[in-house]
């Protein structure tokens, strides 16, 4: 708290300008009118106020707007946004995408702070769903944003928004998240032709079921190994050697390097060794010729 002291003669601020950087904390408190500050918030960011000076300016706004700042002030907070607590932000009603962009710009290039996370949460909840423009904006500032959402939160993403998603936005998504996103992507891209469809759907395939992988194997897609390694193990296991060969095309040779890793390792264990041998890659560990798998869960073999 800054002590209430009278403003020295001739120091009363008539406008928010650069001369204020020479004011001490108590002078800012005494000589800057909160209403003037609120109407000239757009000027604050143009002036190099220190951490301590911003504290005083925030205090003045808090006194003027105890129930939360109006959006006209929020949009122009600039670096003052960094002084806000999540509790402050929860009092706000941010509806404009321009306001969101302006505040995200302040923290650009830095990790998502609790303030930013709260702001985004407030904004998205206010909109009711994560629409395309919002998703576009958020992933531009935070490529990992989508993967920070729970599967429940992702369920509110409309398929139309999927067009805004770039491959790098999904880098940190886990299988549970891709399970939610994949059907939306499939719906979003359903009217595209084969090769274009594959380019778009590729980064979502970690959520694809077996039947969709089988369908893709019929389309000469030449899936790369990096994508294959991200597929759900339970979706890969039922694929035949012929289907995997068609799915990977020329990339099938890469299976050898990955034979000890999932899902390749588990898939190999499910294939007949003579089928694996047809690939000519030297993959070992398949079911020996003449053996029959009766219990898939235990993989007991009888001669």
């Amino acid at each position: 708290e800054v002590e209430k002291t009278a403003c020295p003669s001739g120091k009363k601020a008539r406008e928010i300008d650069e001369s204020l950087i020479f004011y001490k904390k108590w002078e800012l408190e005494a000589c800057v009118d909160a209403a003037l500050l609120a109407t000239q918030m757009d000027r604050v960011n143009a002036i190099p106020f220190t951490y301590e000076q911003l504290d005083v300016l925030k205090h003045k706004l808090d006194e003027l707007y105890p129930q939360g700042y109006p959006e006209s002030v929020i949009q122009h907070l600039g670096y003052l946004f960094l002084k806000m607590s999540p509790e402050d932000i929860r009092k706000w009603n941010v509806t404009s995408l321009e306001t969101l962009k302006a505040l995200l710009e302040v923290n650009k290039g830095h990790e998502m702070s609790p303030q930013v996370a709260t702001l985004i949460d407030r904004f998205v909840k206010g909109r009711g769903q994560l629409d395309k423009d919002t998703l576009d904006t958020l992933t531009a500032f935070y490529p990992g944003y989508l993967c920070s959402l729970s599967p429940e939160e992702l369920s509110s993403v409309p398929p139309s928004s999927i067009w805004a998603v770039r491959p790098q936005d999904l880098d940190t998504c886990d299988p549970r998240q891709l399970d939610v996103l994949y059907p939306k992507a499939r719906l979003a891209f359903q009217n595209m032709n084969g090769s274009e469809y594959f380019v778009k759907i590729q980064s979502f395939l970690g959520g694809a079921p077996t039947e969709d992988l089988k369908a893709l194997s019929q389309q000469n897609v030449s899936m790369d190994l990096a994508t294959f390694m991200k597929l759900r193990t339970d979706a890969v296991l039922p694929l035949t050697v012929a289907e995997v060969q068609k799915l990977l095309g020329p990339h099938v040779e890469g299976l050898k390097a990955e034979e000890r890793h999932r899902p390749v390792r588990d898939w190999i264990l499910r294939q007949r060794q003579d089928d694996l041998d047809t690939l000519g890659l030297g993959l070992q560990g398949g079911i020996p010729n003449g053996y029959l798998v009766l219990d898939l869960s235990m993989q007991e073999a009888l001669s």
Epitope: E18, A46, I47, P48, F49, T50, Y51, Y79, L80, G109
Partner: nanobody, 114 residues
Framework: VQLVESGGGLVQPGGSLRLSCAAS????????VAWYRQAPGEQREPVAA???????IYADSVKGRFTISRDNAKNTVYLQMNSLKPEDTAVYYC??????????WGQGTSVTVS
Amino acid sequence: VQLVESGGGLVQPGGSLRLSCAASGSMFSINAVAWYRQAPGEQREPVAAMTSGGSTIYADSVKGRFTISRDNAKNTVYLQMNSLKPEDTAVYYCNGGWSLAMNYWGQGTSVTVS
């Protein structure tokens, strides 16, 4: 954000120095910036500032002697100090934008006028 100040040193009264401050990213090209100084036992105080629009302002004690400028291409801010006095002795810092608001400072560069 990294701020690296340089150019300080020992100088005789009446002499000149040019301080430089380099920042990572494109921090200085888009933000208001300022030079500050801290004399031994004193609080850090602003000496010169440049708004994001390019206008400049100086503390009364350095007016007419110090000039702040910036090179956006090099992402560097300068402080040209002429007619130096013993009372200008201090550690000089530059800052602006995100790091200033977050209270992150560089190591500063020491100026001694003697």
